[in-house]
């Protein structure tokens, strides 16, 4: 299980995974753009088993999901940090 923790730099991801996570195992996804003291984009997945995984933003599977989310929310203004509940 990959760790997520808070530091004074406000980057939370120590390690990142590129492995596909099925939707039925996901509770929510948080996408934090670079900034606020962290120089990189971070994607954090909260799983239903209560574990947390940092996902490599370049991972193909998460890019495909983010593209799908972008299409779904194209009519709403972008937000700097948001959480998506996965149905």
């Amino acid at each position: 299980v990959l760790e997520v923790y808070y530091t004074h730099l406000r980057c939370r991801c120590v390690q990142e995974s590129s492995v596909f996570i099925p939707r039925r195992f996901i509770d929510r996804i948080q996408i934090s753009p670079r900034g606020n003291g962290c120089p990189r984009k971070e994607i954090i997945v909260w799983k239903k088993n209560k574990s947390v995984v940092c996902v490599d933003p370049q991972a193909e599977w998460i890019q495909r999901i983010m593209e799908m989310l972008r299409k779904k929310s194209s009519s709403t203004p972008p937000v700097p940090v948001f959480k998506r509940k996965i149905p």
Epitope: V1, V19, F20, P22, F25, K47, K48, N49, W61, I65
Partner: antibody, heavy 120, light 107 residues
Framework: EVQLVESGGGLVQPGGSLRLSCAAS????????MSWVRQAPGKGLEWVAE????????NYAPSLKDRFTISRDNAKNSLYLQMNSLRAEDTAVYYC?????????????WGQGTTVTVSS | DIQMTQSPSSLSASVGDRVTITCKAS??????VAWYQQKPGKAPKLLIY???YRYTGVPSRFSGSGSGTDFTFTISSLQPEDIATYYC?????????FGGGTKLEIK
Amino acid sequence: EVQLVESGGGLVQPGGSLRLSCAASGIDFSRYWMSWVRQAPGKGLEWVAEINPESSTINYAPSLKDRFTISRDNAKNSLYLQMNSLRAEDTAVYYCARQDDYEYYAMDYWGQGTTVTVSS
Amino acid sequence: DIQMTQSPSSLSASVGDRVTITCKASQDVNTGVAWYQQKPGKAPKLLIYSASYRYTGVPSRFSGSGSGTDFTFTISSLQPEDIATYYCQQYYSTPLTFGGGTKLEIK
């Protein structure tokens, strides 16, 4: 060493019932999703059902959900499959498998299988 | 349900050959595909997960690729111990589904 050991298979008449068991050792059974997968003689693999650790989420192959019931007892490290109204086409080797949801998300450990024969 | 169409259903190759098996999903499964090896009378073994990641202890001659609907499994140099039936599986959504299998034989 992780071990999944199925039992309860055997010969049963059409219309009969059977309860399969899968005993797990070497893993923290109560943390993992588990699945049943079957394989008819000379055929491919067919997923039957899965259950989450708390037994709050259960999914079935649509064609089997009316006759088969998956359950588990975490205190006994055991997975079960209750099969009712059995038909000749249910004849198969039945495997239990761990459905990992921490690292791999696929079925990473399998039992050796138990054979169910439905015949008159 | 998502259908997984695997081809070929059987394949004969020589030791040292490069072997390729394909699997086509009836709808987008992202990278939620695994590949399993099954030898006669034995349980399946996980080889590849998330379309392209080798499971622990799996030799480097086994590889996988693909995303969306088209997936490929490759054995770069066939060994005698690789004789088995290989299955793709989608675990993107339930019901989980397997391909029909590819029986691999040595020429």
